[in-house]
């Protein structure tokens, strides 16, 4: 009971409010399928409270189960474009440390120009998340069309 | 430490459990692209705990970062219908106060009949969220096909 | 105030951290449209903390408002396949107890090969959630393409 009481008296931050919502900064150079993200109040409605950006990739600072969500809209896209350039695929995964590398979330565009999904997944301090967009189409940089975020849910 | 202890002794409600899940009430009159929402246990599985409805639009009562989510399915829709009536677009945004007006989330239907997405965004007490459906197709009123909600995540 | 203080001194688990993320185990026998799920660290990144599996269906252990989310990708699928086999529909609902049976979330694939959505809904202890996939196409078992989860949000 003592422990529980002490635990409750920690600042709420210590209960784990880690959260981030990012906007697209740019795509990678040729042969690099990764999307590069940015965040911060100066940029609009994106933010990082806990997680950090490491060369445009999201690095986790607190162990726990996270809700990961993403929406990517292709620029200058119609269903004709999307099907002509098929396959265009988005994958979100842990890309470092290499020992923990895994794909968490994968979607193809088929005849659509937007994908959006979310999932719960355990993440550990130091995990870096990468979002790989494969294909020849480019993502929209509009902040209401393309975004990526995580929310700490429980230990 | 005193402050943290006092803070922990507030009812849990004060930690910010604001949440709402709404079902479609009706579309707007001509030239008004907004969807009008309703919520409450008498209507089924929709509810408002904290946020309120103001003429069918959702008004926020507590500052914080929110997870906003939406699904809209078009009535009497097939991929042929959707492409024939293209563009049909859904946008979720802050529509008042005017000084904070911004689009938060935008999706087009292309050859699909349902859009679904979610994002994290800072909202302030008094922000009213509007959901604009542009195009000639109409949203389904089935409660498992069309819904809109917010969940307070952190201060 | 006494009650609030005592309440705060309960272990955090008692605040309701119930959460589950499941991966597809198998589809049902003919005439059974249900998807059968599995979860646990031995299987990869799926887990159950609170809810339980009952013959592959998810059973809730704590009353509250939950965020329910799902992604299902069809195996060996292209937009041509999807439209040729239309309608293929996914519905998530409470399937038992029978008195609470209701559809919570419904999406059709149309010309796409993946559906993904989420919603907030009240669930009660003992509610069992079923995910029905109707049509002739089969879901992918890849853990980054097909998954289903719930997260307790508030009482």
């Amino acid at each position: 009971q003592r422990f529980a009481q002490a635990q409750q008296q920690l600042p709420l931050e210590s209960l784990g409010w880690d959260v981030a919502e990012l906007q697209l900064n740019h795509t990678g150079p040729q042969q690099d399928p990764r999307l590069y993200w940015q965040g911060g109040p100066a940029l609009g409605r994106s933010f990082l409270h806990g997680p950090e950006l490491d060369k445009g990739q999201l690095r986790i600072h607190r162990d726990g189960i996270y809700m990961v969500h993403i929406q990517v809209t292709l620029a200058i896209c119609s269903s004709t474009t999307a099907s002509r350039h098929h396959p265009t695929t988005l994958a979100v995964g842990i890309c470092s440390p290499a020992s923990r590398s895994i794909s968490l979330l994968r979607l193809s565009f088929h005849q659509g120009c937007t994908i959006a999904s979310q999932r719960l997944t355990p993440l550990a301090r130091g995990d870096t998340l990468c979002t790989n967009l494969t294909g020849t189409l480019l993502p929209s940089r509009n902040t209401d069309e393309t975004f990526f975020g995580v929310q700490w849910v429980r230990p | 430490q005193r402050f943290a202890q006092a803070q922990q002794q507030l009812p849990l409600e004060s930690l910010g459990w604001d949440v709402a899940e709404l079902q479609l009430n009706h579309t707007g009159p001509q030239q008004d692209p907004r969807l009008y929402w309703q919520g409450g246990p008498a209507l089924g599985r929709s509810f408002l705990h904290g946020p309120e409805l103001d003429k069918g639009q959702l008004r926020i009562h507590r500052d914080g970062i929110y997870m906003v989510h939406i699904q809209v399915t078009l009535a009497i829709c097939s991929s042929t219908t959707a492409s024939r009536h293209h563009p049909t677009t859904l946008a979720v945004g802050i529509c008042s106060p005017a000084s904070r007006s911004i689009s938060l989330l935008r999706l087009s239907f292309h050859q699909g009949c349902t859009i679904a997405s979610q994002r994290l965004t800072p909202l302030a007490r008094g922000d009213t969220l509007c959901t604009n459906l542009t195009g000639t197709l109409l949203p389904s009123r089935n409660t498992d096909e069309t819904f809109f909600g917010v969940q307070w995540v952190r201060p | 105030q006494r009650f609030a203080q005592a309440q705060q001194q309960l272990p955090l688990e008692s605040l309701g951290w119930d959460v589950a993320e499941l991966q597809l185990n198998h589809t049902g026998p003919q005439q059974d449209p249900r998807l059968y799920w599995q979860g646990g660290p031995a299987l990869g990144r799926s887990f159950l903390h609170g809810p339980e599996l009952d013959k592959g269906q998810l059973r809730i252990h704590r009353d509250g408002i939950y965020m329910v989310h799902i992604q299902v990708t069809l195996a060996i699928c292209s937009s041509t396949t999807a439209s040729r086999h239309h309608p293929t529909t996914l519905a998530v609902g409470i399937c038992s107890p029978a008195s609470r049976s209701i559809s919570l979330l419904r999406l059709s694939f149309h010309q796409g090969c993946t559906i993904a959505s989420q919603r907030l809904t009240p669930l009660a202890r003992g509610d069992t959630l079923c995910t029905n996939l109707t049509g002739t196409l089969l879901p992918s078992r890849n853990t980054d393409e097909t998954f289903f989860g719930v997260q307790w949000v508030r009482p």
């Epitope: - | 479609l24 009430n25 009706h26 579309t27 001509q30 000639t136 109409l138 009123r141 | -």
Partner: nanobody
Framework: QVQLQESGGGLVQAGGSLRLSCAAS????????MAWHRQAPGKQRELVAI???????NVDDSVEGRFTISRDNAKNMVYLQMNSLKPEDTAVYYC???????WGQGTQVTVSS
Amino acid sequence: QVQLQESGGGLVQAGGSLRLSCAASGSIIRDNVMAWHRQAPGKQRELVAIINIGGSGNVDDSVEGRFTISRDNAKNMVYLQMNSLKPEDTAVYYCNVYYRDLWGQGTQVTVSS
């Protein structure tokens, strides 16, 4: 109490046509999205056609090219024009204020082969 009243149903041979009408008191039709549903024996009620306030209508794929929905806001009326009728179109047809639980009594349409 607002009433919706359908008319125009009947018995028709396959390939024939019918025009269903829906009338209401007040301005209920003029001010709302309207729909036609149908229910065949032993089947669930299904949405067949829908029309927005501005007059843009949409019909289900199963009746595309054969049925059209229209409205006359001045007369507070909504119509369903049904051409090239098939036996599988046999059902009770209901007029509905789509976003409200407001229904007519229905009109029987029987298509004989």
